[in-house]
């Protein structure tokens, strides 16, 4: 049995330009200790979309549901979507360290942007 699962329930999300997109992610535990970060794309060129403690992400808001008893919610909402936001978004768990070590990624959610 896996000690930690990172679950992105939607494989894809379609949003009209100008609207907001909600990207869902839950983790089964806070342990191992370490942050959850959101990225667009994979590999060394991936783009950091949201980090709770570092950086400035004016269009991104955490929208977790704290009433969820059986898991921890790390969902985000991205406002004012444009076609440039299209891509696959990954919720990634890190283990705290110096530096933090990537531990597990969700399966990814593909965001597509429809014309207004």
């Amino acid at each position: 049995e896996e000690e930690l699962q990172v679950i992105q329930p939607e494989k894809s999300v379609s949003v009209a330009a100008g609207e907001s997109a909600t990207l869902n992610c839950t983790a089964t535990s806070l342990i191992p200790v370490g942050p959850i970060q959101w990225f667009r794309g994979v590999g060394p060129g991936r783009e950091l979309i949201y980090h709770q403690k570092e950086g400035h992400f004016p269009r991104v808001t955490p929208v977790s549901d704290p009433t969820k008893r059986n898991n921890m919610d790390f969902s985000i909402r991205i406002s004012n979507i444009t076609p440039a936001d299209a891509g696959t978004y990954y919720c990634v768990k890190f283990r705290k360290g110096s530096p933090d070590v990537e531990l597990k990624s969700g399966a990814g959610t593909e965001l597509s942007v429809r014309a207004k």
């Epitope: 000690e3 535990s29 806070l30 342990i31 200790v33 709770q52 977790s64 704290p66 921890m72 969902s75």
Partner: antibody
Framework: EVQLVESGGGLVKPGGSLRLSCAAS????????MSWVRQTPGKGLEWVAT????????YYPDSVKGRFTLSRDNAKNSLYLQMNSLRAEDTAVYYC???????????WGQGTTVTVSS | DIVLTQSPASLAVSLGERATISCRAS??????????MHWYQQKPGQPPKLLIY???NLESGVPDRFSGSGSRTDFTLTINPLQAEDVATYYC?????????FGGGTKVEIK
Amino acid sequence: EVQLVESGGGLVKPGGSLRLSCAASGFTFSSYVMSWVRQTPGKGLEWVATISSGGTYTYYPDSVKGRFTLSRDNAKNSLYLQMNSLRAEDTAVYYCASQLTGSEFDYWGQGTTVTVSS
Amino acid sequence: DIVLTQSPASLAVSLGERATISCRASESVDSYGNSFMHWYQQKPGQPPKLLIYRASNLESGVPDRFSGSGSRTDFTLTINPLQAEDVATYYCHQSADLPWTFGGGTKVEIK
């Protein structure tokens, strides 16, 4: 019904060792993060140790790091706290506690008393 | 370490009235919209019991006269109306960052 039953407490001299056990039942033990929390009249509640559901990751506060070792046997639904180099300030009631998400302590055992005295 | 300061240390409230307990954290315990602050009740000779998780969520089986509120550094546990069986010591606890810490407790008595 969830049950956590601690055992292994007792009187030990400073520098001595004790091994506490916690027997779990009534829930899927292997899915839960497990911890020990102790309570003293002077210092109140103090977190002592935590282990991940599969046993890979363990965490301790500085006050016990290097002296206490937490382990688990999921096949036996059991949690163990090996306490070495015990000090007078380790005297407390030790509670076993479960954490489904590694956050809040969902369930607590009744506690076992550890007294460190010469 | 995140220090949790509970106030008052003791509280005497008449039956049927409101009891309010405060817990202040030395730094924010919020992350991703969650407040990692929890409340426990402990009666003499018993272990602590979870009442409220993540600031405001009532644990299953806990009477709804208990409620929690707050975010970032300031949190409140409210018991309204206070009943005789609520006489106990109440503790706040943060799980936002290691080492996890507890408040010093608030003893609630009947006036």
